[in-house]
């Protein structure tokens, strides 16, 4: 696969993943009422990171935001933080990767700069994806713990209801946002890895160039071994260029080869 394709695909996959992370963060259905014992319910509860909602069978839905910071569980705060960090890193990653794309010309930016930016954006996407996956997983773990705790106390005589009165506790299970978050985090991670792979194809590597032979006299001849393009136009062959006509020349100078930037 060509570097451009790998980089482009990595960018697109990361972009889709990033959009998914934002969607998951904003979704209200991080946890939904468990309907295993009662599949037909008159009141359906579901909760997100920012608000909890109730949907009645009448169709009326009411959502209430969590208007407190101090009163919220530390785990929920941690999940919020992880998702926001993931989004922030994703935004930075997207901005950096746009400038790093090989198919976009920006002034006289050379390939080594683009390689560094591609690597940077790749790492940002990887961290962003990991943040999302960890955030969602922490929330899922919290749900599982609470689920089994509420199962153990399913019919309790507490909460001001004395005697034999049953108080059925609402149990919550995985909501759609968790699955969106896991998939989105995974995509962002994969996209980031692809960007990092593409970076390897853009990185100037001296070992890939042939040895330099000197034809000249004893004078000091300046030469540069790397011959990197100043522009980022497609299809131009990058060959090592002589600085002086009579100066250092490489053994490849006489031939035109596909460059290392065109194929991986």
């Amino acid at each position: 696969m060509s570097v451009t394709a790998c980089q482009g695909l990595g960018f697109v996959v990361s972009l889709i993943g990033f959009a998914g992370i934002i969607a998951a963060t904003c979704m209200d259905q991080w946890s939904t009422q468990d309907l295993y014992n009662n599949p037909v319910t008159a009141v359906f509860n579901y909760q997100g990171l920012w608000r909890s909602c109730v949907r009645e069978s009448s169709g009326f839905t009411e959502c209430r935001g969590y208007f407190t910071l101090l009163g919220l569980p530390a785990m929920l705060q941690a999940v919020r933080a992880l998702m926001i960090v993931g989004i922030v890193l994703g935004v930075i990653g997207i901005l950096v990767s746009i400038f790093a794309l090989k198919c976009i010309r920006i002034g006289s930016m050379d390939d080594s700069a683009k390689a560094k930016m591609t690597l940077t954006s790749g790492i940002l996407f990887i961290i962003s994806g990991i943040c999302a996956i960890i955030g969602v997983s922490v929330f899922a773990n919290m749900l599982v713990t609470n689920f089994w705790m509420s199962t153990a106390n399913m019919y309790s005589g507490m909460g001001g209801m004395g005697g034999m009165v049953q108080t059925v506790q609402t149990r919550y299970t995985f909501g759609a946002a968790l699955f969106v978050g896991w998939v989105a985090g995974g995509l962002t991670l994969i996209g980031g890895v692809m960007m990092c792979i593409a970076c390897r194809g853009l990185t100037p590597d001296d070992s890939n160039f042939k040895a330099v032979s000197y034809h000249a006299s004893g004078q000091n001849v300046a030469y540069r071994p790397g011959g990197f393009k100043a522009s980022t136009g497609f299809g131009s062959n990058t060959r090592n260029k002589k600085i002086y006509d009579g100066g250092a020349r490489t053994e490849d100078d006489e031939q035109s080869h596909p460059t290392k930037y065109d194929y991986v």
């Epitope: 009422q33 009662n38 037909v40 319910t41 008159a42 009141v43 509860n45 579901y46 909760q47 909890s52 909602c53 109730v54 009645e56 069978s57 009448s58 169709g59 009326f60 009411e62 209430r64 909460g159 209801m161 009165v165 049953q166 108080t167 059925v168 506790q169 609402t170």
Partner: antibody
């Protein structure tokens, strides 16, 4: 304004079946579930079941499942309840009612009196 | 199924008196998601269909006189008529709107002396 129109009394033979209608007007018929409630003479209210006119989803009280069938005709904004294998215990007033906010039955029809007698 | 128990089954009062009707459910009707009690009160006058009075245990339906108030939470609920009028002669029902099947109390018949 919201109106639920139910026809007059029905006299049916034991073992027969009857189909009661409830014509809705004054609101978007498919936006609200329709409920049916039974009231025997001098007795309390008993919930029969509900139907969602938008997708014909039904939910029945276990006591009425099998003997009652709820349907809708969206084109005429009418809900129907068919009661089969009628017995004297089915003699009652049957109300249709529209479900509203708070899972309340906010609007009721006038009720159809069904008398099962030979 | 949630069983709704109303008390008393009937009561006779004089106009202007304060009346309280009780309703007890076999399970809590308090929904943790919105902290609302799914308990509804209806008034049924002779020869008429029931009329919605109060929902969410304490929210008065529009058009209902403010002498009618609902209170309670969890499993114990009360309908209070602050100053009974002659037109309040009716049967009052409580209803569970929290879980299927919807269930009604047996009713409280209010008679005016």
């Amino acid at each position: 304004q919201v109106q639920l129109q139910q026809p007059g009394p029905e006299l049916v033979m034991p073992g027969a079946s009857v189909k009661l209608s409830c014509k809705a007007s004054g609101y978007t018929f498919t936006s609200y579930r329709m409920h049916w409630v039974k009231q025997r003479p001098g007795q309390g209210l008993e919930w029969i079941g509900e139907i969602d006119p938008s997708n014909s989803y039904t939910n029945y009280n276990q006591n009425f499942r099998g003997r009652s069938t709820l349907t809708v005709d969206k084109s005429s904004s009418t809900a129907y309840m068919q009661l089969s294998s009628l017995t004297s215990g089915d003699s009652a007033v049957y109300y249709c009612a529209r479900l509203g906010r708070g899972n309340t039955l906010g609007y009721w029809g006038q009720g159809t009196s069904v008398t099962v007698s030979s | 199924d949630i069983v709704m128990t109303q008390s008393p089954s009937s009561l006779t009062v004089t106009a202007g008196e304060k009346v309280t009707v009780g309703c007890k459910s076999s399970q809590s009707l308090l929904n943790s998601g919105n902290q609302k009690n799914y308990l509804t009160w209806y008034q049924q006058k002779p020869g008429q269909p029931p009329k919605l009075l109060i929902y969410w245990a304490s929210t008065r339906e529009s058009g209902v006189p403010d002498r009618f108030t609902g209170s309670g939470s969890g499993t114990d609920f009360t309908l209070t008529i602050r100053s009974v009028q002659a037109e309040d002669l009716a049967v009052y029902y409580c209803q569970n709107g929290y879980s299927y099947p919807f269930t009604f109390g047996s009713g409280t018949k209010l008679e005016i002396k």
